[in-house]
Interface confidence: medium
């Protein structure tokens, strides 16, 4: 019922940016289920995130990324939920269900070409990597109340008011003093009184929904998570300073104990569940380069070992407007020589914590094909091929000539439009075959094209083993075998008797056996047998055999 | 055979709310991902959210990000799709679709295999 696929493929045109984003994510659970229609599957990655380009991207300052890079992530549970082992959470995958391929054309496919760029390094977190991803959505840290602003100045000097101010940091309700004037211009200081003052929320309550980004310094290799709150808050045993917690191990959890004068007890206690280090990972080019022109292969691979729970990581991409949710991804229908950027990000317990950008070039194709001009022999021995270039890249050219079974190639200069064959046999016939080459990650041969000449005809080579034998006194056998070159279309063999220098007998068979009779004994004569192709006759073999005296 | 039955569709004042449901039924199969489409006469199948069924991750196009919710009910054998706010341009028919295998980009209808019938949802101004 879905649309059939354009056969376009994907187009590298310029495309608007892409309508998908994603929702705050839920704590990561897996339930079991009966088995149903919609079931888990057998998969490597468990939980994806979506990509979201029209949100606030994150920016890093290029001097941070000499030591440190930055990640976002949010909704830090506090409470982390058991992961509960079923079969599909099975580190191993199942054969091929780890890799994404696009293979087709969806109409609303569209990949973007990135003019001019160099590849970008695969390494997470070097300058050269471009981040396009989004920073997670921030939940609210504090409750803004809406309070409506009176004028004081408008009301009576006998009215006490009782004035209530939001303390946007705090987020609670304090009394206040209020100065008002009277319509005399006196200053009239009234006493705010209010009978309760609203109690103040628990820091569990109001670091509910806290997140935190993740700093990794590539030296130490060790991680610091800034809190994103607006108030300078309290961590028990000093595990923080300015917000920040410090010297965090990749894969262990770290309990913190968060407070602060604007709420009270219970503290909120937040589990940092630290992620790998950020330089185990490397986004791999896995493209075969048999098929680099139109395919793009890219997938993360873990370079060095970590305790993290692998399950609890997933990997999403984008490439145009297409999103991938695997650890593998696969592009197909490609055009060759073309930029194509994919942007690609790996979460922990489904908070991202580190990207990467490629910027991939696909090979040089397969060039086009030769428009073959004119092909023909206007001689016996030589050839002639004329030809305009293909339209695509190509290195040189190779020439084949086959006549039979034998083939012949040559390998010609891209700058040549025409070769004349030399030294060919004649009156056969030359099948050519003219492709295009390239050598790129391999070499790529375009398609051949093909064209045909006969050679003229020359004169054929000697007809050879030639015998003259008496059968009687004055009859003679003559034989020979073909010439080994006919070098025509036809095949006569003659045979010329000379006695002196007059030509006695002049015979003409389709092959050479030619019994000649009646010829005079005791005499000399010269026997010239040659072939004749029907444009040329050969080179005579002459023999010269007498007759005997007449027995009788 | 394999089933999907999408319910919930209707007639909805502008600003009023939706909740549309999909049941899977017949034989069992391995869904990598459900997800929402709409399409209105004349054009072409609009992908709205998708969730993935090992997980439960969730993608929304732009237009309805914030006020649709896309959830799964793994015992019920159920993906709802809850929809707030509505806006006249939501009106359309709504289809529930189904990838066994997803090999192609999940936001595209040609990556998905079984598909409902479809459920007219109308906003009125």
């Known amino acids: 019922q879905s649309p059939t696929p354009s056969p376009t493929g994907l187009t590298t045109a310029k495309m608007p940016s892409v309508p998908l984003s994603s929702d705050p994510l839920p704590t990561h659970t897996t339930a079991f289920s009966p088995a149903s229609t919609f079931e888990r599957e057998n998969d490597f990655s468990e939980t994806t995130t979506s990509l979201s380009p029209d949100n606030t991207s994150t920016q890093v300052s290029p001097d941070s990324l000499d030591n440190a890079s930055a990640f976002n992530t949010t909704g830090v549970s506090s409470v982390q939920t058991p992961h509960l082992p079923t079969h599909a959470d099975s580190q191993t995958p199942s054969a091929g269900t780890d890799t994404q391929t696009f293979s087709g054309s969806a109409a609303n496919a569209k990949l973007n070409p990135t003019p001019g760029s160099n590849a970008i390094s695969d390494v997470p977190g070097e300058r050269s990597t471009a981040s396009t991803f989004p920073t997670d959505p921030v939940s609210p840290l504090t409750t803004t109340l809406s309070l409506a602003h009176h004028s004081s100045a408008a009301l009576p000097a006998r009215t006490s008011n009782t004035t209530i101010t939001a303390n946007t940091s705090d987020a609670y309700l304090n009394a206040s003093e209020t100065t008002t004037l009277s319509p005399s211009g006196s200053a009239v200081i009234s006493t705010t009184t209010i009978a309760t003052t609203p109690s103040k929320p628990t820091c569990d309550e109001k670091y509910a929904n806290i997140t935190v980004d993740y700093l990794y310094n590539k030296e130490t290799k060790l991680f610091t998570a800034k809190l994103n709150v607006n108030e300078n808050v309290e961590c028990g045993n000093n595990t923080c300073t300015n917000n920040e917690v410090h010297n965090l191990t990749e894969c262990k959890n770290a309990s913190v104990s968060i407070s602060h004068n604007s709420c009270t007890a219970p503290d909120k206690t937040l589990i940092l569940d630290v992620p790998p280090g950020v330089e185990k990972f490397q986004l791999h080019d896995c493209t075969q380069v048999e098929k680099a022109d139109t395919t793009i292969c890219l997938k993360w691979k873990n370079i060095e070992t970590f305790t993290c729970d692998t399950q609890n990581i997933t990997y999403r991409f984008q490439c145009g407007n297409m999103i991938f949710d695997n650890k593998e991804i696969k592009l197909e229908n490609l055009e060759p020589e073309h930029e194509y950027k994919c942007d690609s990000e790996i979460l922990y317990n489904n908070h991202k914590f580190t990207n990467a950008s490629k910027i991939i070039k696909t090979d040089f194709g397969s060039p086009g094909e030769p428009q073959i001009i004119f092909c023909r022999s206007e001689a016996a021995h030589q050839g002639v091929i004329t030809w305009n270039p293909p339209q695509r890249s190509f290195h040189n050219f190779t020439l084949c000539y086959i006549k039979e079974t034998e083939k012949d190639c040559l390998n010609l200069d891209k700058n040549l439009i025409k070769y004349d064959l030399q030294n060919l046999k004649p009156y056969t016939k030359y099948v050519l075959s003219l492709h295009a080459y390239i050598i790129a990650k391999v070499q790529r041969n375009g398609s051949a094209a093909m064209c045909h000449f006969t050679t003229k005809s020359a004169p054929p080579s000697q007809v050879w083993n030639m015998t003259v034998s008496m059968t009687s006194d004055n009859s003679m056998h003559v034989k020979c075998r073909p010439p080994r070159d006919r070098n025509g279309p036809h095949e006569r063999y003659h045979l010329e008797v000379e006695a002196g220098n007059t030509l006695v007998r002049n015979e003409s068979h389709k092959n050479c056996d030619f019994r000649v009779k009646d010829l005079q004994y005791s005499t000399d004569y010269t026997f010239k047998a040659y072939f004749h192709n029907g444009d040329y006759p050969g080179e005579p073999f002459i023999l010269h055999h007498s007759t005997s005296y007449n027995s009788k | 055979e394999v089933q999907l039955v999408e319910s919930g569709g209707g007639l909805v004042e502008t600003g009023g709310s939706l909740r549309l449901s999909c049941a899977g039924s017949?034989?069992?199969?391995?869904?990598?991902?459900v997800g929402w489409f709409r399409q209105t006469p004349g054009k072409e199948r609009e992908f709205v959210a998708s969730?993935?069924?090992?997980?439960?991750?969730?993608y929304y196009a732009d237009s309805v990000k914030g006020r649709f919710t896309i959830s799964r009910d793994n015992g019920k054998n159920t993906v709802a799709l809850q929809m707030n706010n509505l806006k006249p341009e939501d009106t359309a028919v709504y289809f529930c679709?189904?990838?066994?295998?997803?090999?192609?980009?999940?936001?595209?209808?040609?990556?998905?295999?079984?598909w409902g019938q479809g459920t007219q949802v109308t906003i009125s101004s």
């Open positions: 969730i993935r069924w090992s997980g439960g991750h969730t």
């Open positions: 017949g034989r069992t199969f391995s869904s990598r991902h």
């Open positions: 679709a189904a990838a066994v295998r997803l090999t192609a980009p999940l936001n595209f209808d040609t990556s998905y295999d079984y």
